[in-house]
């Protein structure tokens, strides 16, 4: 058993049929010694008396808010949560496996630049009685500070018969140099509590590996005289690290109709313009990627050909 | 401790081409190592990230773009003195700070070159003959060092009398390649910045 925060405790349980469970001793936070009784949640049934209460925690029915009272007055609370371990593996029931980039990916993180700011998100089908708490650091043995905000519900989607909820959090490394060469990864830890179930999820990464630039901005077309070719130009996204001559991007320019299976014109360039063949009912799209360290491509920025 | 916006001679800054080749060569070599050593811990997640140049050179700080010198987190207190007669830019226009940066890059390359050559000598003794260093990568390191053209004491190649542990050598190769790729990215960024200045 360990303390998650004040008056909230996590009991780690091996979860299998007829498991013996864990013996837990609760102590009432009071100078009083006599006349103390214990109850669980809203029940008025007295579970025991005395300054300490010893319980055998085996299942969710044994978890909850234990309260010690004296003469009708509440003295203190202890909330017990369960953390299940099945076949030596901690449960991951609360969050959905996003399976990208690999199986057992519960947290996904992205950074728009090298400033040390990044966003992580996760998915769940649970809509109520759900809380998240996020901590982060650079390295684990001698951790350096990363400050994370509160996790917020950022999107709701319908997937078949189920509703899916996306939560996200923004974090900022306290003293980040965009040009630095990372040797210690960022560690992100998410505590998830659903009703009386506790789970924790972690992710470890280098900012350089989670870079995904914003799409290029200000796409403009200039038809070339006596030709089907069009000169398309664009600019670096505002959110990208500066100077751009140091933090350079490379671009992919594509002309394609509405369907992915349609024919296309595609060219890669390090410049902020390119010449392509425009077709009726097609769109010109441009996306960006770090020129020197191949992490993710940005989303496409598009303009119609006509 | 940073790169001022200098005005190099017009035309292609000669080291830019070499640095692009360097990044390409080390990336290819790292990819080859990951594939060949698939049953060794050779991915970014599996290895310890070590920098053999730590406390010996300070390329990131010495080559910091002017725009980042206002960022407190980028200014490191480490001071290292470097030889200052580089030839990637016309000598008259090579400022002291830029020479400091380029000589730091040269020292990095020299250190990695020695490590790679020592390691290759060990890998050549491996009866499995599983992996060797790409000669192209070693040649590209050499070309960039020549383009930088710094005079510096030659570092003797480390020789070891004990029987090499090939497993450890291959893991060390992965660690070295990962670190060198990161440094090659920095070098490419620096050369691109200098070329645009």
């Amino acid at each position: 058993i360990w303390e998650l925060k004040k008056d909230v405790y996590v009991v780690e349980l091996d979860w299998y049929p007829d498991a013996p469970g864990e013996m837990v001793v609760l102590t009432c936070d009071t100078p009083e010694e006599d006349g103390i009784t214990w109850t669980l949640d809203q029940s008025s049934e007295v579970l025991g008396s005395g300054k300490t209460l010893t319980i055998q925690v085996k299942e969710f029915g044994d978890a909850g808010q234990y309260t010690c009272h004296k003469g009708g007055e509440v003295l203190s609370h202890s909330l017990l949560l369960l953390h299940k371990k099945e076949d030596g593996i901690w449960s991951t029931d609360i969050l959905k496996d996003q399976k990208e980039p690999k199986n057992k990916t519960f947290l996904r993180c992205e950074a728009k630049n090298y400033s040390g700011r990044f966003t992580c998100w996760w998915l769940t089908t649970i809509s109520t009685d759900l809380t998240f708490s996020v901590k982060s650091s650079r390295g684990s043995s001698d951790p350096q500070g990363v400050t994370c905000g509160a996790a917020t519900l950022s999107a709701e989607r319908v997937r078949g018969d189920n509703k899916e909820y996306e939560y996200s959090v923004e974090c900022q490394e306290d003293s980040a140099c965009p040009a630095a060469e990372e040797s210690l990864p960022i560690e992100v830890m998410v505590d998830a509590v659903h009703k009386l179930k506790y789970e924790n999820y972690t992710s470890s990464f280098f900012i350089r590996d989670i870079i995904k630039p914003d799409p290029p901005k200000n796409l403009q077309l200039k038809p070339l005289k006596n030709s089907r070719q069009v000169e398309v130009s664009w600019e670096y996204p505002d959110t990208w690290s500066t100077p751009h001559s140091y933090f350079s991007l490379t671009f992919c320019v594509q002309v394609q109709g509405k369907s992915k299976r349609e024919k296309k014109d595609r060219v890669f360039t390090d410049k902020t313009s390119a010449t392509v063949i425009c077709r009726k009912n097609a769109s010109i799209s441009v996306r960006a990627q770090d020129r020197y360290y191949s992490s993710s491509w940005s989303e496409w920025a598009s303009v119609p050909c006509s | 401790r940073n790169l001022p916006v200098a005005t190099p001679d017009p035309g292609m800054f000669p080291c830019l081409h070499h640095s692009q080749n360097l990044l390409r060569a080390v990336s290819n070599m790292l990819q080859k190592a990951r594939q060949t050593l698939e049953f060794y811990p050779c991915t970014s997640e599996e290895i310890d990230h070590e920098d053999i140049t730590k406390d010996k050179t300070s390329t990131v700080e010495a080559c910091l773009p002017l725009e980042l010198t206002k960022n407190e987190s980028c200014l490191n207190s480490r001071e290292t003195s470097f030889i200052t007669n580089g030839s990637c830019l016309a000598s008259r226009k090579t400022s002291f700070m830029m020479a400091l940066c380029l000589s730091s890059i040269y020292e990095d390359l020299k250190m990695y070159q020695v490590e790679f050559k020592t390691m290759n000598a060990k890998l050549l003794m491996d009866p499995k003959r599983q992996i060797f260093l790409d000669q192209n990568m070693l040649a590209v390191i050499d070309e960039l060092m020549q383009a930088l053209n710094f005079n510096s004491e030659t570092v003797p190649q480390k020789s070891s009398l004990e029987e090499p542990d090939f497993y450890k050598t291959k893991i060390k190769l992965c660690i070295l390649l990962h670190a060198f790729r990161i440094r090659a990215v920095t070098i490419d960024r620096v050369m691109s910045y200098l070329n645009a200045s």
């Epitope: 089907r228 070719q229 490379t250 299976r261 349609e262 024919k263 296309k264 014109d265 595609r266 060219v267 890669f268 360039t269 390090d270 010449t275 063949i277 077709r279 009726k280 | -």
Partner: antibody, heavy 118, light 107 residues
Framework: QVQLVQSGAEVKKPGSSVKVSCKAS????????LHWVRQAPGQGLEWMGW????????EYAPKFQGRVTITADESTSTAYMELSSLRSEDTAVYYC???????????LGQGTLVTVSS | DIVMTQSPLSLPVTPGEPASISCRAS??????LHWYQQKPGQQPRLLIA???QSISGVPSRFSGSGSGTDFTLTISSLQPEDFATYYC?????????FGQGTKVEIK
């Protein structure tokens, strides 16, 4: 299976024209760009131009501009390349090629040898 | 027009050994570079697209690398069926242009 089948070999006199055909099978004809590339005996490859069969748009290499005409007939899934004012240096194997990507070729025809000789 | 220069023009190789062919562009073409294989009396066949993207059905011993002006086609271990002529082609701008070809011959 995508296939491009070209017309047979031709022998032409200098100053005349030649029209080579290329019939496509497998996949929708207008879903692909069609190119013509030639190869003189013992020489390398030379790109001549492309057509978008969907709308008839064409682009030619400056070297052939005014001498080459590429057309397409959607009803028969056939593309044509006509080269006029033939000279001896036009002796070559002419390939049609196609791809959903405009700028390179993932399938090429078997080639048509055009010999220009007096 | 962008000029593509291949080297060497002829490459004698022992079967089972690796082979590397170089292609250089007269100006930077990013990764807009494709490789083809042509055997005598046959049409060219696409091997690699956009400098390093493998093509389905092409053996994994063929790999490509490079960007900007310098590109390499590598055959990790030459098989008897790999003896052929190899061409690079740029798609950075029209007109599309090819290298002069590299003939890989049995040593």
């Amino acid at each position: 299976q995508v296939q491009l089948v070209q017309s047979g070999a031709e022998v032409k006199k200098p100053g005349s024209s030649v029209k080579v055909s290329c019939k496509a099978s497998g996949g929708t004809f207008s879903d692909y760009y069609l190119h013509w590339v030639r190869q003189a005996p013992g020489q390398g490859l030379e790109w001549m131009g492309w057509i978008d069969p969907e709308n008839g748009d064409t682009e030619y290499a400056p070297k052939f501009q005014g001498r080459v005409t590429i057309t397409a007939d959607e009803s028969t899934s056939t593309a044509y390349m006509e080269l006029s004012s033939l000279r001896s240096e036009d002796t070559a194997v002419y390939y049609c090629a196609r791809n959903k990507e405009l700028r390179y070729f993932d399938v090429l025809g078997q080639g048509t040898l055009v010999t220009v000789s007096s | 027009d962008i000029v593509m220069t291949q080297s060497p023009l002829s490459l004698p190789v022992t079967p089972g050994e690796p082979a590397s062919i170089s292609c250089r562009a007269s100006q930077s073409i990013s990764i807009n570079l494709h490789w083809y294989q042509q055997k005598p009396g046959q049409q060219p066949r696409l091997l690699i697209a956009f400098a390093s993207q493998s093509i389905s059905g092409v053996p994994s011993r063929f790999s490509g690398s490079g960007s900007g002006t310098d590109f390499t086609l590598t055959i990790s271990s030459l098989q008897p069926e790999d003896f052929a002529t190899y061409y690079c082609q740029q798609s950075n701008s029209f007109p599309l242009t090819f290298g002069q070809g590299t003939k890989v011959e049995i040593k």
